[in-house]
């Protein structure tokens, strides 16, 4: 019996204050460096230990960053996205998309708590 994997997608606004060494995370993606097939979005690839993002705790590796200080990250070259973050100022507002994996029961059986119910 195979289990079915669903994804619960949520969005969140995260406000970070730039620390002494910056925001404290790495990104991948962009129109010239697609991280996800057919998706040129910007994704968090690493949260640096003891950095601003890690200390805040909400941003996670694998999150998709939709906007920075209200500026959409769609259709940006990787370099341009990096520059946008680096020039974002002291207080940085991130609109992010979390994608949580939800493991459900066997196919044909909808278990309790199944979000598709």
């Amino acid at each position: 019996m195979n289990g079915r994997v669903d994804y619960l997608v949520t969005e969140e606004e995260i406000n970070l204050t730039r620390g002494p060494s910056g925001l404290g995370f790495n990104i991948v993606g962009g129109t010239d460096q697609q991280y996800v097939s057919n998706d040129s979005g910007i994704y968090v690839s690493r949260i640096k230990e003891n950095g601003a993002a890690a200390l805040d705790g909400r941003l996670q590796e694998g999150d998709k960053i939709l906007s920075v200080n209200g500026q959409d990250l769609k259709n940006l070259l990787h370099q341009d996205a990096v520059d946008l973050f680096r020039n974002a100022g002291y207080a940085v507002s991130l609109r992010v998309q979390h994608r949580l994996q939800v493991q459900n029961g066997p196919i044909g059986h909808r278990g309790e708590g199944d979000p598709s119910g």
């Epitope: 060494s21 910056g22 404290g24 995370f25 991948v28 690493r46 950095g51 990787h78 680096r86």
Partner: nanobody
Framework: EVQLVESGGGLVQAGASLRLSCAAS????????MAWFRQAPGKEREFVAE????????WYSDSVKGRFTISRDNAKNTVYLQMNNLKPEDTAVYYC?????????????????????WGQGTQVTVS
Amino acid sequence: EVQLVESGGGLVQAGASLRLSCAASGGTFSSYAMAWFRQAPGKEREFVAEDSWSNHRVWYSDSVKGRFTISRDNAKNTVYLQMNNLKPEDTAVYYCAAYCDYSGSTVDPPNQSEYDYWGQGTQVTVS
């Protein structure tokens, strides 16, 4: 373990050009972000320029933007720093540095704590 060896430094007049080279060995060169830092007498080491081939990015400090150009030759495992219109304040020991950037681009300004490997440095003096 990556070894870095810088060359190309020297004594030049203000307004002249120099090209520094940094030869790397012991790693998969194209997977490394390569950078140049410099340290002037009595000052802290500061970032100059960075090139990440795998992540399609370059980055310069404001003090060298428009005058210095970083480039790399992955076939030769070498990174270069072309320095034009040199000024006396460019006098420093120039260091090549590297780190493996498989985990994407840092959104923070380059910080020497990110770099795992360093060369011994080459002296540039502008009179």
